[in-house]
């Protein structure tokens, strides 16, 4: 039997400078594309190698992005969220939620779609 899986949730402000190829990550989520059950939030699904986010090093796959330049990402359609990032300017401030898995007992399995990465 697997041990209990707990999560440590932390928030962080990440300031990125848009690089030659942009911010360098992919997102999933939105009111029309729920990636996590009962949660229409926006999550990072991919960090592009050598992109701005990868070079900064703080943004991780599985992170939930709460706001962009102070604008809340709640209740947005997926494409509206994408467009918000694309139009966010050169200096982009992200409020993100990291969800770190903490194991108690035997290691469990984290499946695809689990926001912890």
């Amino acid at each position: 039997m697997n041990g209990r899986v707990d999560y440590l949730v932390t928030e962080e402000e990440i300031n990125l400078t848009r690089g030659p190829s942009g911010l360098g990550f992919n997102i999933v989520g939105g009111t029309d594309q729920q990636y996590v059950s009962n949660d229409s939030g926006i999550y990072v699904s991919r960090i592009k190698e050598n992109g701005a986010a990868a070079l900064d090093g703080r943004l991780q796959e599985g992170d939930k992005i709460l706001s962009v330049n102070g604008q809340d990402l709640k209740n947005l359609l997926h494409q509206d969220a994408v467009d918000l990032f694309r139009n966010a300017g050169y200096a982009v401030s992200l409020r993100v939620q990291h969800r770190l898995q903490v194991q108690n007992g035997p290691i469990g399995h984290r499946g695809e779609g689990d926001p912890s990465g």
Epitope: G22, N26, I27, V28, Y35, K48, V82
Partner: nanobody
Amino acid sequence: EVQLVESGGGLVQAGGSLRLSCTASGRTFSTYTMAWFRQAPGKEREFVAAISWSGTYYADSVKGRFTISRDNAKNTVYLQMNSLKPEDTAVYYCTAVIGSTVDSYSPSDPLEYDYWGQGTQVTVS
């Protein structure tokens, strides 16, 4: 890890049709951006078509002849190929990435995608 399995290739006469299928693993298939590339012997890999959350994209060489579509309930993306020409002969590869890029999307750039299938041979005689 996303697994992609292509099927539907074969030998067809010029002017004929084929429908390629690509079935993907994973329970969040609807969030995947999917594409088809092809590679003919001695030639570079070439973009064919892509389907993202926001729409579909085609290479000029196949526009009006090929149609990309998806069935999220079946975790499958399709490439309907009509009016096939001998120059369409190639190995066709399915590719995918989870989510949508927040940057300008370049569907024909192989670096946009993380996962690749093994390919299916299409021969037009």
